[in-house]
């Protein structure tokens, strides 16, 4: 009944020789207003574009079967850096983050994060400084004001500093991330740490007594056993995207959050292909209502740690790691020497009571089926702001289990699987390039997406 996610992004900065262009100053007070609905929506779209860029690259270079990252956490770390970035470095950061609004990005992001799903979402930021390193007062003030990042002085004793940082990370993520850093480079001048802890409760719980061992189809040939959560009449918003054909479902959490699952109907897909034509609007079509659905969703525990230097470099932020203009932080030159990110996610039935009345009312409607039993992508969105908090992909939810060869009669091979979609109504409303939305209708149709 509950989902837990803890991401953490660390920006590590070191000394750099001075070199220089003149500084740009944005007018004071211009960003202090609350974000308008239009700004919020624009930011959600920008964040979705950044998420697609970032995750496509991470997935391209990773050999892990399962991935999870928090684009919001990374964006917050970069926008914290943007507070002190100038000229070409600031411009580049804004462009990578798709932030047309520019100088107000840190203010907008931090403001929106303060309002995210109260109780479910905790943001903690902290800055560690080399003893005696001169940081500009303006940067310190804005950091504390926007990100609650009170500067903490490093002692210079590696062991103590490491222990202090890891202890703070552990507390900030409520014990979910135990050993974040294994070492600290000697030349560390500035560490920006960003921890987000998220705990979401399904709005409609899964009954643990229905959870059973089931097969997850890795490809046409192989399966792995998984613990599959089940619900007979789950109120679910779901639809089908075409070209490429992808089933999309919105599982609602309490606290205005959604777990959005994307299950491509073909096995031959890569993250870049799927994300290429995906936008915020594609995933949030109007006129798709909740309907009672037979649901199967695997229990999951995901944990992924990565250094994002190469990825951010490829994204267009090469200069952060070579010769950035960060003179808004200090007149002494700085260079980013590392960007560490870690997220964990737990998907299970355990948790709070279900909204039973809703389920009963909906059980009178016709039934369809949504089964997450093959590789999929997922997002976690905050529904009020539309911000993507997490993105991930699951190729094998049980990588430690031996793969099992499918028996021919059990196989939900694409032929059978696609056959089962034959009677599925086809919508012709286009969403973005090459993407069609296919909302489910009120009639019954063949068992959708479930292997026989």
């Amino acid at each position: 009944n509950q989902e837990q996610v803890s991401p953490l992004t660390l920006l590590k900065l070191g000394n750099q020789e001075p070199g220089g262009q003149t500084a740009l100053k944005s007018p004071p007070g211009v960003c202090s207003r609350d974000p308008t609905p239009e700004q919020t929506h624009r930011l959600a779209r920008a964040m979705m574009a950044f998420t697609a860029d970032l995750f496509s690259l991470v997935a391209q270079t990773s050999t892990c079967p399962n991935l999870i990252l928090s684009p919001l956490s990374v964006a917050l770390a970069l926008s914290h850096l943007a507070l002190g970035a100038q000229n070409h470095t600031l411009q580049r950061l804004q462009q990578v983050l798709h932030a047309g609004s520019g100088p107000c990005l840190p203010h907008l992001l931090s403001r929106l994060c303060q309002d995210l799903g109260p109780g479910a979402f905790r943001l903690a930021a902290r800055m560690y400084l080399q003893k005696g390193f001169p940081i500009k007062e303006d940067f310190l003030e804005q950091s504390e004001q926007l990100f609650g990042a009170k500067p903490v002085s490093l002692t210079g004793k590696q062991e103590d500093d490491l222990a202090n940082i890891n202890q703070w990370v552990k507390e900030a993520t409520e014990g979910k991330i135990q050993e974040f850093l294994s070492g600290l480079p000697e030349d560390t001048v500035l560490l920006l740490l960003n921890a987000i802890h998220f705990q979401g409760f399904w709005r409609n719980k899964f009954d643990p007594s229905l959870t059973q061992r089931d097969s997850f189809h890795l490809d046409e040939q192989f399966t792995v056993p998984v613990e599959m959560m089940q619900a007979r009449t789950y109120p679910l918003r779901w639809f089908l995207l075409e070209q490429p054909e992808i089933q999309v479902a919105h599982f609602p959490f309490k606290n205005n959050m959604s777990f959005v699952v994307l299950v491509p109907t073909h096995f031959e897909w890569n993250v870049s292909q799927v994300l290429a034509n995906l936008s915020w609007d594609t995933l949030h079509p109007p006129l798709v209502w909740e309907r009672p659905t037979k649901v199967r969703l695997p229990k999951l525990y995901l944990k992924h740690q990565m250094d994002l230097v190469a990825t951010l470099s490829q994204l267009g932020l090469q200069e952060l790691f070579q010769a950035p203009d960060l003179r808004g932080i200090s007149e002494q030159s700085l260079v980013v020497s590392g960007v560490q990110h870690q997220s964990t996610l737990e998907l299970s039935e355990v948790g709070v009571e279900a909204a039973a009345a809703t389920s009963i009312a909906m059980s009178r409607m016709s039934l369809s089926s949504f089964s997450v039993n093959r590789p999929f992508l997922f997002f976690i969105f905050e529904d009020t702001t539309g911000l993507p908090l997490f993105v991930g992909s699951v190729r094998n939810p049980n990588p430690s289990a031996p793969r099992e060869l499918k028996e021919q009669q059990d196989s939900p091979g694409n032929k059978d699987f696609l056959q089962s979609l034959k009677g599925f109504p086809r919508g012709d409303k286009l969403f973005g390039p090459d993407l069609k939305l296919v909302p489910p209708m009120e009639e019954d149709y063949p068992q959708f997406g479930s292997p026989k």
């Epitope: 750099q16 490829q314 994204l315 200069e319 070579q322 260079v335 020497s337």
Partner: antibody, heavy 119, light 107 residues
Framework: QIQLVQSGPELKKPGETVKISCKAS????????MNWVKQAPGKGLKWMGW????????TYAEEFKGRFAFSLETSASTANLQIKNLKNEDTATYFC????????????WGQGTSVTVSS | DIQMTQSPASLSASVGETVTITCRAS??????LAWYQQKQGKSPQLLVY???TLADGVPSRFSGSGSGTQFSLKINSLQPEDFGSHYC?????????FGGGTKLEIK
């Protein structure tokens, strides 16, 4: 004045290894990224990748992953390109070129090193 | 990866004429484009960076323009030393690819 001086021409057999050097002078070596560019005879320029002269982190274009390696000798302000298991199609002139963060261009180039691979 | 398409591939012009070379990017590269000139047997030389800023020592008859996906290099009143190959290169996401080049010859 700023200069990038590359090592001399190389004649190699298929399967051998070659190492080309690029010595920088007249500026702070670690403040600027170093790029490598290939130009086959009569052809255009091909970006091979760059190396971060601060961290030593290389980035390779897809086509140049595997047999190609960028390295640094920071104390000597020198960047190196090594090509293993040479093939005939590696016959080309290889340029090093300095990348300037902020101006987004390669403002200074080495004179080029000609590598001929022939049995 | 962003592809750079340069046109024309070759061009014949006379001294004193004005020529324009274009470069199209397969995706938005903002203004992160540079132009180079290369003479036979020599290293390339930077002409223009950030799409329209002239590099030090480059004559004002050269000018760059464009942003997003469409860019051009214009040379007014061609001089004998302007002939050779001209290349564009983007500096957005890596790989930082070059265009195929334009060979500018004396008519």
């Amino acid at each position: 004045q700023i200069q990038l001086v590359q090592s001399g021409p190389e004649l190699k057999k298929p399967g051998e290894t070659v190492k080309i050097s690029c010595k920088a002078s007249g500026y702070t070596f670690t403040n600027y990224g170093m790029n490598w560019v290939k130009q086959a005879p009569g052809k255009g320029l091909k970006w091979m990748g760059w190396i971060n002269t601060k961290s030593g982190e290389p980035t390779y274009a897809e086509e140049f992953k595997g047999r190609f390696a960028f390295s640094l000798e920071t104390s000597a302000s020198t960047a190196n390109l090594q090509i293993k298991n040479l093939k005939n199609e590696d016959t080309a002139t290889y340029f090093c070129a300095r990348w300037v963060p902020g101006t987004y261009a390669m403002d200074y180039w080495g004179q080029g090193t000609s590598v001929t691979v022939s049995s | 990866d962003i592809q750079m398409t340069q046109s024309p591939a070759s061009l014949s012009a006379s001294v004193g004429e004005t020529v324009t070379i274009t470069c199209r990017a397969s995706g938005n590269i903002h203004n992160y484009l540079a132009w180079y000139q290369q003479k036979q047997g020599k290293s390339p030389q930077l002409l223009v960076y950030n799409a329209k800023t002239l590099a030090d020592g480059v004559p004002s008859r050269f000018s760059g323009s464009g942003s997003g996906t469409q860019f051009s290099l214009k040379i007014n009143s061609l001089q004998p030393e302007d002939f050779g190959s001209h290349y564009c290169q983007h500096f957005w996401t890596t790989p930082w690819t070059f265009g195929g080049g334009t060979k500018l010859e004396i008519k």
